[in-house]
């Protein structure tokens, strides 16, 4: 069975400053990723950063960086200020689009006893929804 | 809840121009569909694909406002446009606005997929 694990690290030289790594554990060929804070996209959250394996890549403040890491992970950096930077509680969620297997999505926040710029290594974070 | 609210509809002559405008708002959170689409509805008729465009710019136009109307997306990625130039006749009908994503990313043929709709603006060319 497919499934995603999500990493959220805060950068020890900026407090303001996150960054959040996805990856997909399966078999298919990933055809879209979405990354979001607050909640899945187009339910409670707002999509940070869409990306495309072909297509390119789309970004909305306060993501500063997104990229592709491998064919099936990915990295965001966030850093903002006020109102539209994240805080220590936000949830980040990554979707996962892949042929044949669907869509998968998973999200975190960081761990509540971390220090900036320490985290848990990657695990699979538990699956919310398999369309 | 996702709400979608379209805004540029009137009266205009044969030849004329129109700017439709389409905001996707939510509350408590930012939608950026995937994709945002017009239809449009002529009295009498079914409805009908006008325009699509993704998130990533990719436009799609029924053969009908080749050439004629323009899809565009604010950097924002929740506000569509459809600037109508040399509008004719049979462009007479009400226009509406649709949100929804996809597995690629892409608009869906025809509209499929599309889950949020907006109440619709009229537009007739008349002179």
């Known amino acids: 069975t497919p499934e995603v694990w999500v990493q959220v690290r805060m950068e020890a030289t900026e407090l303001s400053s996150f960054t959040i790594r996805c990856g997909f554990l399966g078999s298919g060929s990933i055809s879209l990723v979405t990354v979001s804070w607050g909640g899945p996209n187009g339910a409670g959250g707002t999509t940070l950063a869409v990306l495309h394996p072909e297509r390119g890549i789309r970004q909305w403040a306060p993501a500063r960086q997104a990229r592709w890491e491998t064919q099936s992970s990915i990295s965001l950096i966030l850093e903002g200020s006020g109102a539209s930077s994240p805080c220590a509680n936000t949830t980040f969620c990554c979707k996962f689009a892949s042929f044949p297997e669907g869509s998968w999505e998973a999200c975190g926040s960081l761990p509540p006893s971390s220090d900036p710029g320490l985290s848990a290594p990657p695990t699979p974070a538990p699956i919310l929804r398999a369309d | 809840e996702v709400q979608l609210v379209e805004s540029g509809g009137g009266l205009v002559q044969p030849g004329g121009s129109l700017r439709l405008s389409c905001v996707a708002s939510?509350?408590?959170?930012?939608?950026?569909?995937?994709?945002m689409a017009w239809f449009r509805q002529a009295p009498g008729k079914e409805r009908e694909a006008v325009a699509g465009?993704?998130?990533?710019?990719?436009?799609t136009y029924a053969d009908s406002v080749k050439g004629r109307f323009t899809a565009s997306r604010d950097n924002a990625g929740f506000s569509l446009y459809l600037q109508m130039n040399s509008l004719r006749a049979e462009d007479t009908a009400v226009y509406y606005c649709?949100?929804?994503?996809?597995?690629?990313?892409?608009?869906?043929?025809?509209?499929?997929?599309?889950?949020?709709w907006g109440q619709g603006t009229m537009v007739t060319v008349s002179s």
């Open positions: 465009i993704d998130i990533f710019g990719g436009t």
């Open positions: 649709a949100a929804g994503d996809s597995p690629d990313g892409r608009c869906p043929p025809l509209g499929q997929g599309l889950n949020y």
């Open positions: 939510a509350s408590g959170f930012t939608y950026r569909p995937y994709c």
